[in-house]
C-alpha cells in the first residue's frame, strides 16, 4: 500500500482576483499537509544467503517499507554505495534493470522488494564476509540504504542469523532535505492555518493545466542542510574486496537505459508471475531522474556514489543495527 503525494500545479493568479500571495497560501498548505501526513520513517531490510546448490552463489534480497514510491534501487557490494562500494545492479521501476558481473539476475519480486543472484565463479566472485548494500531512493522519504553480509560460519542454504549488525544509512541529504523541509513545512502550515482563522479564505481557482501535475520539488536538499548533521562513521571492513569491474560499466551517460529491451523495463515481477503487479507510472519523477542519469554518465557506477538520488556529502556515515534504523 503505497501512497503517492500528488501535488496540484501552482497556477498564476487570475488578474483582478486574489493575487499571487493569496493563491499561493491556499495551495501550499495542501502541498505541505499531504507531505506531513504521508511522511513516515521507512524500513529497509537486506537478506544475504548462500545457495546450497552452488556454494559460491549468493542471493541478495532487499525490501523497502514506507509510504513513498520507489524511484530507484541500487545494489552494491564492498560497502555502501556512497562509500567506496561497487555497484552490482540498478533497478528502475519503469526504465528497467541494469546489472554488472558478477550479478547474474536482478529482478523486482514485488513493488517494494528486489532480488539479485550473483555468479559464484571467477575473479570477481564474492566471498562469505562481503558486505552487500541496497539503497532505495523514494519520494518523499529520500534515500535509504541498508547493508548485510553472510557470516563465514553460516551453513549453505541458510540466511544470515540476526547476530551481525549490518549498516543502515539514510543519506544526509535525504534526511535533512526531506525531514527539514517537512518539519519547516508543518510549522509553516500551522502558522498559515492560524492566520487563516483571522481572515476570510480566498476563492479557489480552477486549475487549467493538465491533470498530471508536477510533484513538489521541496524535497531536493540544499547544500546548507547537507552540512548540518554529523554522525559517527564506522568503516565496513571486508577482507574480500571485489575485483574492479571497469570493462563491465558503460560510460555512455543517460542513454545507457535505452539499451534495455522494452519488455524488461516496465513492471516489477513477482517470483511466480513475472508480470503480476505493474507499478503506477511516475511521470513526475522524470526531471529528477534525468539528472540522475546524467550524473551516472559523468561517474560510472563502480566509481562510487554515482546514481544516488541526492549528492552524497563527503561527511561521515552512521554504523547502524540490522534493521534499517536511523
Amino acid at each position: 500500500m503505497r501512497t503517492e503525494a500528488q501535488v496540484p500545479a501552482l497556477q498564476p493568479p487570475e488578474p483582478g482576483l486574489e493575487g499571487a500571495m493569496g493563491h499561493r497560501t491556499l495551495v501550499l498548505p495542501w502541498v505541505l499537509l499531504t507531505l506531513c501526513v504521508t511522511a513516515g520513517t521507512p524500513e529497509v531490510w537486506v537478506q544475504v544467503r548462500m545457495e546450497a546448490t552452488e556454494l559460491s552463489s549468493f542471493t541478495i534480497r532487499c525490501g523497502f517499507l514506507g509510504s513513498g514510491s520507489i524511484s530507484l534501487v541500487t545494489v552494491s557490494w564492498g560497502g555502501p554505495n556512497g562509500a567506496g562500494g561497487t555497484t552490482l545492479a540498478v533497478l528502475h521501476p519503469e526504465r528497467g534493470i541494469r546489472q554488472w558481473a558478477p550479478a547474474r539476475q536482478a529482478r523486482w519480486e514485488t513493488q517494494s522488494s528486489i532480488s539479485l543472484i550473483l555468479e559464484g565463479s571467477g575473479a570477481s566472485s564474492p566471498c562469505a564476509n562481503t558486505t552487500f548494500c541496497c539503497k532505495f531512493a523514494s519520494f518523499p522519504e529520500g534515500s535509504w540504504e541498508a547493508c548485510g553480509s553472510l557470516p563465514p560460519s553460516s551453513d549453505p542454504g541458510l540466511s544470515a542469523p540476526p547476530t551481525p549488525a549490518p549498516i543502515l544509512r539514510a543519506d544526509l541529504a535525504g534526511i535533512l532535505g526531506v525531514s527539514g523541509v517537512l518539519l519547516f513545512g508543518c510549522v509553516y502550515l500551522l502558522h498559515l492555518l492560524r492566520r487563516h482563522k483571522h481572515r476570510p479564505a480566498p476563492r479557489l481557482q480552477p486549475s487549467r493545466t493538465s491533470p498530471q501535475a508536477p510533484r513538489a520539488r521541496a524535497w531536493a536538499p540544499s547544500q546548507a542542510s547537507q552540512a548540518a548533521l554529523h554522525v559517527p562513521y564506522a568503516t565496513i571492513n571486508t577482507s574480500c574486496r571485489p575485483a574492479t569491474l571497469d570493462t563491465a560499466h558503460p560510460h555512455g551517460g543517460p542513454s545507457w537505459w535505452a539499451s534495455l529491451p522494452t519488455h524488461a523495463a516496465h513492471r516489477p515481477q513477482g517470483p511466480a508471475a513475472w508480470a503480476s503487479t505493474p507499478i503506477p507510472a511516475r511521470g513526475s519523477f522524470v526531471s529528477v531522474e534525468n539528472g540522475l542519469y546524467a550524473q551516472a554518465g559523468e561517474r560510472p557506477p563502480h566509481t562510487g556514489p554515482g546514481l544516488t538520488l541526492f549528492p552524497d556529502p563527503r561527511g561521515p556515515r552512521a554504523m547502524e543495527g540490522p534493521l534499517g534504523v536511523r
Epitope: 500500500m1 534480497r61 525490501g63 517499507l65 514485488t110 513493488q111 543495527g321 534493521l323
Partner: antibody, heavy 118, light 107 residues
Framework: QVQLQESGTELVKPGASVKLSCKAS????????IHWVKQRPGQGLEWIGN????????NYNEKFKSKAALTVDKSSSTAYMQLSSLTSEDSAVYYC???????????WGQGTTLTVSS | DIVMTQSQKFMSTSVGDRVSVTCKGS??????VAWYQQKPGQSPKALVY???DRHSGVPDRFAGSGSGTDFTLTISNVQSEDLAEYFC?????????FGAGTKLELK
C-alpha cells in the same frame, strides 16, 4: 539473552488513557525496530505500528493513528505505547516485538492485558 | 491493505501426521511472508521467514513454501506440542497484516 518485558495487566475506564511499556534487555536497543501488535480475545493479530529506537521515527497502521502514540526512552531501553480515548473495543492483549533479520518478529514480549470497563 | 487469508480456521490432525496450513495474499507479496505459532496464553513464536527460511531453533519438521500470493506451512510428523494456532504475516508493505489464524487440533 534477549528479553522484552511488558508492563502488567491494566484495568481502565472508558474515555481514559493508558501507557503501556516494553523494557528491552540483552541486546543493543537502538539497533532494532520495535513493533506493537494487538490481539483481541479469541481473535487474530493486528499490527499497530513500529518505532525506530535510535531516532523515534514511527509508522502507524492507519486504523490506529488516532488511537496509539509510540515513544521510546533510550536511557532505560524502554518502548512505550500510549492508548487514548479508550473504549471496550480496545480491550485486548498488546504485544511488543523486536524486528529481526531480515524481517520478522524474532522476540515478543509476554503481552499486556488491557481491560476497558466502567 | 494486503489481506492475508487463512481459509481454514481449524484443522484436525493426529500425532505423526503431515499437515499443511495455507495462506493466500490479496496481492503479490513475493517471498515476504513469515509464519508464527501461538499456544493458548502465550506470545507468538516465529517459525519461518522469507516464506521458506526456518528461524533458529525451529525443528526441521516445520517447512515453509510458496511465493507471490500462495503460501504453505507444512508440519511433517506432527507432535503433540505442535497443537497450536498458526498465523501467516506479510511484510511486503505497510500496514503489516496477519492471517486470521489456523488452529491445529487433535482428531
Amino acid at each position: 539473552q534477549v528479553q522484552l518485558q511488558e508492563s502488567g495487566t491494566e484495568l481502565v475506564k472508558p474515555g481514559a488513557s493508558v501507557k503501556l511499556s516494553c523494557k528491552a534487555s540483552g541486546y543493543t536497543f537502538t539497533s532494532y525496530w520495535i513493533h506493537w501488535v494487538k490481539q483481541r480475545p479469541g481473535q487474530g493479530l493486528e499490527w499497530i505500528g513500529n518505532i525506530n529506537p535510535s531516532n523515534g521515527g514511527t509508522n502507524y497502521n492507519e486504523k490506529f493513528k488516532s488511537k496509539a502514540a509510540l515513544t521510546v526512552d533510550k536511557s532505560s531501553s524502554t518502548a512505550y505505547m500510549q492508548l487514548s480515548s479508550l473504549t471496550s473495543e480496545d480491550s485486548a492483549v498488546y504485544y511488543c516485538a523486536r524486528r529481526g533479520l531480515p524481517y520478522f518478529f524474532d522476540y515478543w514480549g509476554q503481552g499486556t492485558t488491557l481491560t476497558v470497563s466502567s | 491493505d494486503i489481506v492475508m487469508t487463512q481459509s481454514q480456521k481449524f484443522m484436525s490432525t493426529s500425532v505423526g501426521d503431515r499437515v499443511s496450513v495455507t495462506c493466500k495474499g490479496s496481492q503479490n507479496v513475493g517471498y515476504n511472508v513469515a509464519w508464527y505459532q501461538q499456544k493458548p496464553g502465550q506470545s507468538p513464536k516465529a517459525l519461518v521467514y522469507s516464506a521458506s527460511d526456518r528461524h533458529s531453533g525451529v525443528p526441521d519438521r516445520f517447512a515453509g513454501s510458496g511465493s507471490g500470493t500462495d503460501f504453505t506451512l507444512t508440519i511433517s510428523n506432527v507432535q503433540s506440542e505442535d497443537l497450536a494456532e498458526y498465523f501467516c504475516q506479510q511484510y511486503n508493505s505497510y500496514p503489516l497484516t496477519f492471517g486470521a489464524g489456523t488452529k491445529l487440533e487433535l482428531k
